[in-house]
């Protein structure tokens, strides 16, 4: 295995609101990822960095600093919040996110996360880009796994 | 003083298995790694593997094909290795020791038990 | 695995005489932090192991300044520059940068 892992396991919550005027939703995303350490020292993890897309455009991000230090053999699960605002030439979302009639506002967003650690004066970056399901209409608190926009693509076992 | 203290000498039968115990005293308990090896009689040492008490996290030599099994319990300050489906190559002294580390770095195997003697006859 | 091939297989000696012991890896042992974790261990007839070197040529606490450990890349040596009576048993070099972490076959140094 690589000596370091990190794995994007998915979106936690989503929390929403809106700018009726200015026909703009806000969306604080949060996000859960698996970091772990198949070294025999410990780490540190100097910074995270994230961006989240929608239709190729770029909504949100947001960079963690000096966020842990991960022992060896060991994993450490971190959330990160990342603020987005669909707005502009995407104000044509506000229809559909507050729509009344429709139950759940899924729309998908791409998440890219970048995890940094240093190693003696190095830095050593791992990436990870996701798909995954949001609903812009509530606030919602997801299972882990359960937003990632593949798995819903997947016929039911 | 820094110890690990082993339980005795154990003789089992083939096919079942055994747990060997290693007690930690002297030292803080999660901030080393525990590792396991191994010495049949009349022969050299081999590397079991390794736990970290802390995390549970372990690493194995895979040659042993999943005979040894690691686990700590933090509060007892015991690393412990179960041993299954026992056969006479099994039979040996085994060994825990404690391994320091530190960001970026790791130190070695600065203190060992005195070794837990594992018989398998029938 | 890393084969760890050590020589002598027994190395004679009197006492006072200095001793050589050789380590070869069959492939790099640099981890990837760029240190070397190739360790020495001491064993005497009935007791566990004991430290001697770290990290190619750190003597442990305690160890004498008679025991010296030096290499690099895939070719490391112990030396022992007056050999003693306590000093007699089977010693060990160990690697510790790819899993599984291996030792070499032992060299018994006894008396001539």
């Known amino acids: 295995p690589r000596s370091i892992d990190v794995k994007y396991i998915g979106v936690k919550s989503a929390y929403v609101s809106y700018d009726v005027q200015k026909r703009t939703i806000y969306l604080n995303i949060t996000n859960t990822l698996n970091i772990t350490n198949n070294n025999y020292y410990s780490v540190e993890v100097e910074n995270i960095t994230a961006q989240v897309q929608f239709s190729k455009t770029v909504i949100g991000k947001a960079r963690l600093n000096n966020i842990t230090i991960i022992g060896p053999l060991d994993m450490k699960q971190i959330d990160y919040t990342v603020p987005t605002v669909i707005a502009e030439e995407m104000s044509y979302m506000y229809d559909f996110c507050t729509l009344i009639s429709i139950k759940v506002h899924n729309i998908v967003l791409m998440m890219q996360v970048t995890v940094t650690t240093t190693y003696f004066g190095h830095s050593e970056q791992i990436s990870q880009e996701r798909y995954q399901y949001v609903d812009c209409g509530r606030n919602t608190t997801y299972q882990l796994g359960q937003s990632e926009y593949l798995n819903v693509l997947q016929p039911q076992q | 003083q820094v110890q690990l203290q082993q339980s005795g000498a154990e003789l089992v039968r083939p096919g079942t298995s055994v747990k060997v115990s290693c007690k930690a005293s002297?030292?803080?308990?999660?901030?080393?790694?525990i590792e396991w090896v191994k010495q049949r009689p009349g022969q050299g040492l081999e590397w079991i593997g390794v736990?970290?008490?802390?995390?549970?996290?372990?690493k194995y030599n895979e040659k042993l094909k999943g005979k040894a099994t690691l686990t700590a319990d933090k509060s007892s300050s015991t690393a412990y290795m179960q041993l299954s489906s026992l056969t006479s190559v099994d039979s040996a002294v085994y060994f825990c020791?404690?391994?320091?580390?530190?960001?970026?770095?790791?130190?070695?195997?600065?203190?060992w038990g005195q070794g837990t003697s594992v018989t398998v006859s029938s | 695995d890393v084969l760890m091939t050590q020589t002598p297989l027994s190395l004679p000696v009197s006492l006072g005489d200095h001793a050589s012991i050789s380590c070869r890896s069959s492939?790099?042992?640099?981890?990837?932090?760029?240190?070397?974790?190739l360790e020495w261990y001491l064993q005497k007839p009935g007791q566990s192991p004991k430290l001697l070197i770290y990290?190619?040529?750190n003597r442990f606490s305690g160890v004498p300044d008679r025991f010296s450990g030096s290499g690099s890349g895939t070719d490391f040596t112990l030396k022992i520059s007056r050999v003693e009576a306590e000093d007699l048993g089977v010693y060990y070099c160990?690697?510790?940068?790819?899993?599984?972490?291996?030792f070499g076959s032992g060299t018994k140094l006894e008396i001539k």
């Open positions: 492939q790099s042992i640099v981890y990837n932090n760029g240190n070397t974790y």
């Open positions: 736990i970290n008490p802390g995390s549970g996290g372990t």
């Open positions: 020791a404690r391994r320091g580390y530190t960001i970026y770095d790791f130190y070695a195997m600065d203190y």
């Open positions: 160990f690697q510790v940068s790819h899993v599984p972490f291996t």
């Open positions: 990290k190619v040529s």
């Open positions: 002297g030292y803080a308990f999660t901030n080393y790694l």
